[in-house]
Amino acid sequence: EEELQVIQPDKSVLVAAGETATLRCTATSLIPVGPIQWFRGAGPGRELIYNQKEGHFPRVTTVSDLTKRNNMDFSIRIGNITPADAGTYYCVKFRKGSPDDVEFKSGAGTELSVRAKPSAPVVSGPAARATPQHTVSFTCESHGFSPRDITLKWFKNGNELSDFQTNVDPVGESVSYSIHSTAKVVLTREDVHSQVICEVAHVTLQGDPLRGTANLSETIRVPPTLEVTQQPVRAENQVNVTCQVRKFYPQRLQLTWLENGNVSRTETASTVTENKDGTYNWMSWLLVNVSAHRDDVKLTCQVEHDGQPAVSKSHDLKVSAHPKEQGSNTAAENTGSNERNIY
């Protein structure tokens, strides 16, 4: 003898987050009379998703007109799917009863899986700057994806990195997942223009991975090299001494001139020149009135770069004999006409 069966033809349905899921259900008979209900999960803790008879289910629409008595299609559509909607959905036929309807037959269930895109990877570097030859750690995080399978790669200037560790959480079943990866990068003096890239590939991205980037310019500190030179005499009794501050990054730099240990002038790097590698050069000069000094003068160029302890370079200025020829006597210390032209 024929008896009503509830057919859920789809064992599983895969839907992208934000889209609409269609869960199909057909009853093979119009009798017994009674409503259909949809549940997520089975057993006493199951969640009511739709009740044909009563209730308000704003995200659910029926595919067919359930008010028509000859309808056998009890499929539903659930709008604006999120990973939290994942689960097994059951179409259940009830038989009209008094006072309550009685559960009559259930479908085999349809597993709804939600494909959710990972969020844009966020790459963060160390809190403090580090100098070349040091190893620094970068972290990359992406959240909210499903299914769990995901691939993460690290690159530095297009070259794939191998020294990293990645975790996907949680380990067990979940509606959505997060990935966290830490990569170790050795800094070089040429890294001002370098980029570290975290690349995430997931089934939802259709072969177009998401990328997060960090500029090493935010991480690196290249300390300056100093050179103090004495220039030819510019005027009667005056000597021009320059301090070349080379290959530093970032630009934040303060220079102090000391004459025999006493502060003569302090200035902040302003009109710098940029090198191809992104580092900066700067020059400061000091006019020393030789006639004001009876003894030799020790000139010190002291540089405080990016809040670090000061570095300095000194130069002994001899004032005892032939002040007019002083410049020519020390011309060998001149670093070249290019620097002379800067000021």
Epitope: E1, E2, P9, R24, T28, S29, L30, I31, N71, M72
Partner: antibody
Framework: QVQLVESGGGVVQPGRSLRLSCAAS????????MHWVRQAPGKGLEWVAV????????LYADSVKGRFTISRDNSKNTLYLQMNSLRAEDTAVYYC???????????????WGQGTMVTVSS | DIQMTQSPSSLSASVGDRVTITCQAS??????LNWYQQKPGKAPKLLIY???NLETGVPSRFSGSGSGTDFTFTISSLQPEDIATYYC?????????FGGGTKVEIK
């Protein structure tokens, strides 16, 4: 007026394929479930397949399951039946028919086409 | 599948006669039963739906009754244009099934 016109029938060898079409006019095709029903020469009527108004649900008679595919193009007001692996016992007049009530997967047929003959013979 | 047994398989009656056809279902199908008329070389036409409801435009000499397993189709006064084969069809259970048909002829 409300009309269904089938086409695509003919003589075909066993194991071969054929596609039937049913052009609908005079009603809102996209609101109705549609069926194929066949009738072997000198025999009674046999239901073959149904498709929901929006194509979301399809059901087949056991005798054609896995061989026949019902589909529709609501933009063209046309119903289709793709028949593969045809057998001699598939020889019949094939009718397309409309479900009586809008937006239902119902099995009362209120409008029928004139039919198209399919002969499966070697 | 639900078996639908129609009787008689054919009948001959005079114009103006009352004609009755019966249809028996192999199990209870409530009142989910339709009656169709098929003239030679033509498509079937719905006459009665839900066992007793007359389809729009169908002459009132056609009627139907019954519920459960036993159903009756009646032509109260046979007309020459009623020469056709009549089929019952249940749509309570899938797949929908038809009776074997009753061929009505004029004496």
């Amino acid at each position: 007026q409300v009309q269904l016109v089938e086409s695509g029938g003919g003589v075909v060898q066993p194991g071969r394929s054929l596609r039937l079409s049913c052009a609908a006019s005079g009603f809102t095709f996209s609101s109705y479930g549609m069926h194929w029903v066949r009738q072997a020469p000198g025999k009674g009527l046999e239901w073959v397949a149904v498709i929901a108004y929006d194509g979301s649900n399809k059901l087949y008679a056991d005798s054609v399951k896995g061989r026949f595919t019902i589909s529709r193009d609501n933009s063209k007001n046309t119903l289709y039946l793709q028949m593969n692996s045809l057998r001699a016992e598939d020889t019949a007049v094939y009718y397309c028919a409309r479900t009586q009530l809008k937006y239902t997967l119902g099995f009362a047929f209120d409008i029928w086409g004139q039919g198209t003959m399919v002969t499966v013979s070697s | 599948d639900i078996q639908m047994t129609q009787s008689p398989s054919s009948l001959s009656a005079s114009v103006g006669d009352r004609v009755t056809i019966t249809c028996q279902a192999s199990q209870d199908i409530s009142n989910y039963l339709n009656w169709y008329q098929q003239k030679p070389g033509k498509a079937p036409k719905l006459l009665i739906y839900d066992a007793s409801n007359l389809e729009t435009g169908v002459p009132s000499r056609f009627s139907g009754s019954g519920s459960g397993t036993d159903f009756t189709f009646t032509i109260s006064s046979l007309q020459p244009e009623d020469i056709a084969t009549y089929y019952c069809q249940q749509f309570t259970y899938l797949p929908p099934t038809f009776g074997g048909g009753t061929k009505v002829e004029i004496k």
